[in-house]
């Protein structure tokens, strides 16, 4: 697994760098994070053929993976910082879940999925100390995630797969436009 | 890092159009942010607009914005920047840039490719 933020070589190299600022901080937890959802979806698709598949046909589907909208204040029309920085903290903690889902689908890259599954955690914690409003913030319920962890597992194996892929792809755009809008704050 | 190649600059005159195109030949090109950004003579370079690896996921710069309109055509490989309306202070080298992790920003520093540049003069 890549090493975590902020302990590349580089770090090392450069003791008397400026140490990171909070959205520099969160600018790179991010990348990485995007990083790891890199690996993993090259031994998805390396696996299978779900790759291939059209966004339209893999949007049949009965997940229910947090995405952005308009109305979240994290596009350019009707931005609000406020409201999105509450969208993307919420999603991260809906998104756990599903990453918690990922963690025995690797084969090759098990230390990969895990890096990726505690560097959100840690992303949320940074997250949550930028927010003010942390009283609109809802954490899903731990039962009904238990019931959906159980259900996704008793899928059969092309079920499971195409849950996998459909998971990295939604993380992958959430974390996207989630930067994207950070990088206005 | 991808090639990334602009075309489409010239000589226009004041209310006129025109449009950009940033083309690269290398593989997984949708998978990149793309960053329109311009430098006039004795200025420093500046964010013009950006498209994300979701091509509905865009941002202007608060100069351009209703005049361009930044797209994708990722089975071309390309990313067009419509500009229309165009002011003799729209006059400068137009440059894209992309960012691998398809997020992109009004950063310099986001990017890591960028082209040669194409010049772009409003004048009558």
């Known amino acids: 697994a890549p090493v975590p933020p902020g302990e590349d070589s580089k770090d090392v190299a450069a003791p008397h760098r400026q140490p990171l600022t909070s959205s520099e901080r969160i600018d790179k937890q991010i990348r990485y994070i995007l990083d790891g959802i890199s690996a993993l979806r090259k031994e998805t698709c390396n696996k299978s053929n779900m790759c291939e598949s059209s966004k339209e046909a893999l949007a049949e589907n009965n997940l229910n993976l947090p995405k952005m909208a308009e109305k979240d204040g994290c596009f350019q029309s009707g931005f609000n910082e406020e409201t999105c920085l509450v969208k993307i903290i919420t999603g991260l903690l809906e998104f756990e879940v599903y990453l918690e889902y990922l963690q025995n689908r690797f084969e090759s890259s098990e230390e990969q999925a895990r890096a990726v599954q505690m560097s959100t955690k840690v992303l949320i914690q940074f997250l949550q100390k930028k927010a003010k409003n942390l009283d609109a913030i809802t954490t899903p319920d731990p039962t009904t995630n238990a019931s959906l962890l159980t259900k996704l597992q008793a899928q059969n194996q092309w079920l499971q797969d195409m849950t996998t892929h459909l998971i990295l792809r939604s993380f992958k755009e959430f974390l996207q436009s989630s930067l994207r809008a950070l990088r206005q704050m | 890092e991808v090639q990334l190649v602009e075309s489409g600059g010239g000589l226009v005159q004041p209310g006129g159009s025109l449009k950009l195109s940033c083309t690269t030949s290398?593989?997984?090109?949708?998978?990149?942010?793309v960053g329109w950004f311009r430098q006039a003579p004795g200025k420093e370079r500046e964010f013009v607009a950006d498209?994300?690896?979701?091509?509905?996921?865009?941002w202007y710069a608060e100069s351009v914005k209703g005049r361009f309109t930044i797209s994708r055509d990722d089975a071309k490989n390309t990313v067009y920047l419509e500009m229309d309306g165009l002011k003799p202070e729209d006059t400068a080298v137009y440059y894209c840039?992309?960012?691998?992790?398809?997020?992109?920003?009004?950063?310099?520093?986001?990017?890591?490719?960028w082209g040669q540049g194409t010049q772009v003069t409003v004048s009558s």
């Open positions: 290398g593989r997984r090109f949708s998978e990149y942010a």
């Open positions: 840039a992309a960012d691998k992790y398809g997020v992109g920003g009004n950063a310099q520093g986001y990017y890591d490719s």
């Open positions: 498209i994300g690896e979701q091509a509905e996921n865009t």
